[in-house]
């Protein structure tokens, strides 16, 4: 049966007619009108942007648009107390002092309140020492530094390049190699892409241009104040010493002109190969300390910023299911921004809006979806993604038992290459069909289906002729509904050519010139990639909410289960001797997903037969696929992150943004040579695997038939 | 060698108008933006306008913005400064120079080109 | 419009002097701040840019420090070819602004 017998309504209303609503023109207009001025959270520019979306969306013709407010802890710089770094010399005097802003772009000259660039929730310091150069301050940089080149942090402020892993795990790898201080920065090897201009006359970095943003380690806690309940009116608060993923030493960033200047004078090491170099003219020594001349110049931070309990406002929409209204598809993205948000979030948001609009259109003309459609624009994303966790700490039960999707819409674009989707291997086929159905807008493709130009593009490493998908990590808001609520999840986006572009993310996020312009100049003029993001984003919720069978495929599942099985079992198995001393077996996990794959392949089967004009039935089916992404949920979490409650899925725990599969097995191998009680972490091994085993064959269970 | 020589300036006539350029040679002129400064006799130096490398851009000191076009020919090496409704007050040196993008400075100058504008 | 004040128009040194000429803005310009020599016949070089960076092929006996609003040139070592006026330059917005200038004379 189509789509639109479910609510009886006239086949004009169908997935087509929702996205032939969508318009590029549209979503570039609203990209405009939100990127004028800054939206920080918990501001006041932020809370009236709130107040607009919440009266556009009612205009559009939802049901009902409300904002949901909460107290979390949020940190900005002292407006009479600038942060900067500074070179002294012998005798205590600033020789050299880092920028305190950012040079405006055109255009913007006179725009007020725009936050100088912060590292958010650092703490108040003003440490001196010597300089250590740790590359990205990834796991492996500081097991080469001090394993192999015996070079102690202890003591020391640590400069590191932004890029491959999230800055929060930086900057906790700094503090557990003891360092009193970090320093970020953007190196141009990562931030400036060769034979492109910077900005504003191309999408490069210019050496003032600075990136922002959090060094939490909040592993999914949302409120540092408030872990596992919403930061309402009664909430009780932790005090600021027991709040959860604060950074203990003071943290700031600055650009690769300010950056030169400190690595210029570099002493000690030598870089220990190519892959410590970045593009900079300067020798990328690691250290200690400066070169001869300047040996007895130190570097001394000055951090001021506060941390605050402020108000933020996410605003939630509603659009009412006609037949599965306790059913709930959501469609959510990113409000504030950490100056004017060209790319991060408003591209998303832009998208959002029009996605909403063209909802709103066709429910005027009488239709409805078959569940409900939750709409939600989330409010202090940037700050450790506290809106999203708020509401949904504060709705968990709700949720629980009636979401059926969520659907991620933060940035509609990194770049202009090819489709990028992450999502639970339940949506690979939805995923595949829609795209499949959508035009490519890409050059080259014209006639073709996004399907084509997707996979030519960015093909799967498993499976020819299929585009890759990838793991859900974090760093976004589906977060806490896939990790913790197990709530199945997706995103998509245009992006780069990875193979080509090296640079990490793109060059001009979090800065102040993520603008407007950025986009309608650099990106996407014809805002053809932003309309193709909305018909992604848009259709996957359309089919979520509004099929008869819900649209996801267990058996995708069980391939994966599979894959993911094989990949941690080569992993142990570069320990054969301690896997033989300790009986470290995997045959119950081997056992339990040749079960799910067996259960699975039966559940498909019956799917395919059963009554669909039976509602208790459907009910049912549908119910056994809503609920198989939260089976693989442990109530007790993984060990030490006990938000992160997926066993199949959880971010990597030394890079936030990056999905690790079985990550209580992988964690538990992780470094497992280097552990003083071999016998104890073994044990720990086999007690993960143990608990993989059992979830997916207690999720594999979720699916036999009922009686 | 770095050089950038500018046309030959002159007395003009207030009200009218006068076209100069500056010759680029010795580096690619499509990589930089350029500029024109100019000096008063006995005076400070103020900023013209400049123009990015494309040409698609270009920025004015404001008073002078309806009155002066800055453009520039890649394919020739030419920058040029159009002014028209020239003014006793537009009577200056005027330096053409090479800026590395929109926030860099001018790292290489012309020698100068006097224009005197008087009845 | 930012306005660059350099408070000493003219400076008198003797050779081998170490001379510093200063920079004012009316607002933090955030380390955008050049600094260019003009000899008596009128030519103009680029001696430092970004506040304390040294351009090619300058003397390293000129040297820049400053951040904010607040900014100055040094010549460790006065030489006779050093006399010449100077002008700091700010770069952080429109319209790019310039200072007076300081001219040096040798005592």
């Known amino acids: 049966k189509s789509s639109n017998e479910a609510t009886n309504i006239t086949p004009k209303h169908n997935m087509k007619a929702f996205l032939d609503e969508l318009k590029a023109e549209n979503i570039k207009k609203f990209l405009y009108n939100f990127t004028q001025i800054p939206h920080l959270a918990g501001t006041e520019q932020n809370f009236q942007l709130a107040k607009q979306i919440q009266s556009q969306w009612k205009e559009f013709g939802l049901d009902s648009v409300e904002l949901a407010h909460y107290d979390v802890l949020l940190s900005y710089p002292n407006k009479t107390h600038p942060n900067y770094i500074s070179i002294i010399n012998e005798d205590g005097n600033e020789i050299f002092n880092t920028s305190l802003f950012e040079p405006p772009p055109p255009g913007y000259e006179n725009v007020s309140d725009i936050v100088p660039p912060f590292s958010a929730f650092s703490p108040q310091g003003m440490p001196e020492g010597d300089l250590v150069y740790v590359n990205y301050a990834r796991t492996e940089d500081f097991f080469k530094l001090e394993r192999d080149m015996k070079i102690n942090c202890s003591g020391k402020i640590v400069i590191a390049r932004y890029g491959k892993v999230f800055r929060g795990n930086k900057v906790k790898n700094a503090q557990l190699a003891g360092a009193k201080g970090v320093i970020l920065y953007s190196d141009p090897a990562d931030y400036f892409a060769p034979g492109v201009k910077s900005y504003p006359d191309g999408w490069n970095l210019p050496g003032g241009g600075v990136q922002r943003g959090n060094i939490l380690n909040l592993n999914g806690a949302g409120d540092p104040l408030t872990p596992g309940y919403p930061a309402n009116e009664y909430a009780y608060r932790r005090g600021i010493a027991e709040a959860v993923g604060l950074p203990s030493i003071p943290v700031h960033p600055i650009g690769y002109y300010d950056a030169q200047k400190l690595l210029e004078k570099m002493g000690g090491s030598a870089p220990p190969d190519s892959s410590w170099r970045g593009s900079l003219k300067v020798p990328y020594n690691v250290g200690p300390g400066f070169t001869g001349n300047f040996s007895t110049q130190k570097v001394k931070m000055h951090i001021h910023s506060t941390n605050e309990v402020t108000r933020i406002y996410n605003v939630i929409g509603t659009l009412r299911g006609a037949v599965e209204p306790d059913r709930y598809v959501i469609l959510g993205g990113h409000r504030d921004s950490w100056v004017f948000g060209g790319i991060d979030p408003q591209s998303g948001a832009a998208v959002v809006h029009e996605i909403v609009r063209s909802f709103g259109t066709l429910k005027k003309e009488g239709w409805r979806p078959r569940r409900t459609i939750l709409f939600a624009s989330w409010d202090a994303e940037e700050f450790g993604l506290l809106g999203s966790t708020e509401w949904a700490e504060e709705n968990s039960r709700l949720l629980q038992e009636r979401g059926v999707a969520y659907i991620n819409a933060d940035s509609s674009i990194e770049g202009n290459y090819t489709l990028r989707v992450d999502c639970t291997p339940l949506m690979y086929s939805l995923v595949h069909n829609l795209t499949k159905e959508l035009k490519s807008p890409d050059e080259g493709f014209e006639g073709k289906s996004l399907y084509e130009s997707w996979t030519k593009k960015s093909p799967s490493p498993e499976f020819s002729g299929m585009p890759r998908i990838s793991k859900l990590g974090s760093g976004n808001d589906f977060e806490v509904f896939f990790q913790r609520l197990g709530i199945a999840s997706g995103r998509a986006r245009y992006t780069k050519n990875w193979e080509t572009n090296k640079f990490s993310g793109y060059p001009l996020y979090h800065s102040v010139y993520e603008t407007y312009e950025l986009v309608e100049k650099f990106y996407d003029p014809m805002f053809k990639y932003h309309l193709t993001v909305a018909q992604v984003r848009g259709g996957m919720v359309f089919e979520l909410a509004n099929s008869i069978v819900l649209p996801f495929d267990c058996r995708d599942y069980a391939v994966v289960l599979r894959k993911y099985a094989d990949k941690i079992y080569s992993i142990s198995m570069k320990h054969p001797q301690e896997m033989k001393t300790y009986s470290v077996s995997f045959d119950s996990l081997f056992s339990a997903v040749k079960n799910f794959t067996e259960i699975a392949s039966k559940f498909s089967e019956r799917l395919q037969d059963f009554d669909k004009s039976n509602p208790i039935v459907l009910r049912m089916m549908n119910d056994q696929l809503m609920f198989l992404e939260r089976a693989f949920i442990d109530p007790l979490g993984l060990p030490d992150r006990p938000f992160y409650r997926h066993v199949i899925y959880a971010p990597s725990s030394h890079n936030k943004y990056a999905g690790e599969s079985f990550p209580g097995i992988y964690d538990a191998l992780f470094d497992i040579e280097s552990k003083v009680d071999p016998s104890k972490a073994w044990g720990e091994v086999k007690r993960q695997i143990y608990v993989a085993a059992f979830t997916v064959q207690a999720a594999a269970e979720t699916l036999s038939e009922v009686a | 060698e770095v050089k950038l020589v500018e046309s030959e300036g002159g007395l003009v006539q207030p009200g009218s108008s006068m076209k100069l350029s500056c010759t680029a040679s010795g580096f690619t002129f499509s990589d930089y933006y350029m500029a024109w400064v100019r000096q008063v006799p006995e005076r400070g130096l103020e900023w013209v306008a400049n123009i990015n490398y494309d040409g698609s851009s270009t920025y004015y000191l404001d008073s002078l913005k309806s009155r002066f076009i800055i453009s520039r020919d890649n394919a020739k090496n030419i920058l040029y400064l159009q002014m028209s409704s020239l003014k006793s007050e537009d009577t200056a040196t005027y330096y053409c120079?090479?800026?590395?993008?929109?926030?860099?400075?001018?790292?290489?100058w012309g020698q100068g080109t006097s224009v005197t504008v008087s009845s | 419009d930012i306005q660059m004040t350099q408070t000493t128009s003219s400076l008198s040194a003797s050779l081998g002097d170490r001379v510093t000429i200063s920079c004012r803005a009316s607002?933090?310009?955030?380390?955008?701040l050049n600094w260019y020599q003009q000899k008596p016949d009128g030519t103009v070089k680029l001696l430092i840019y970004?506040?304390?960076s040294l351009h090619s092929g300058v003397p390293s006996r000129f040297s820049g420090s400053g951040s904010g609003t607040d900014y100055s040139l040094t010549i460790s070592n006065l030489e006779q070819e050093d006399i010449a006026t100077y002008f700091c330059?700010?770069?952080?917005?429109?319209?790019?602004?310039f200072g007076g200038g300081t001219k040096l004379e040798i005592k």
């Open positions: 330059q700010q770069g952080n917005r429109l319209p790019r602004t």
């Open positions: 970004y506040t304390s």
């Open positions: 607002q933090d310009i955030s380390k955008y």
């Open positions: 120079a090479r800026g590395g993008d929109y926030w860099d400075a001018m790292d290489y």
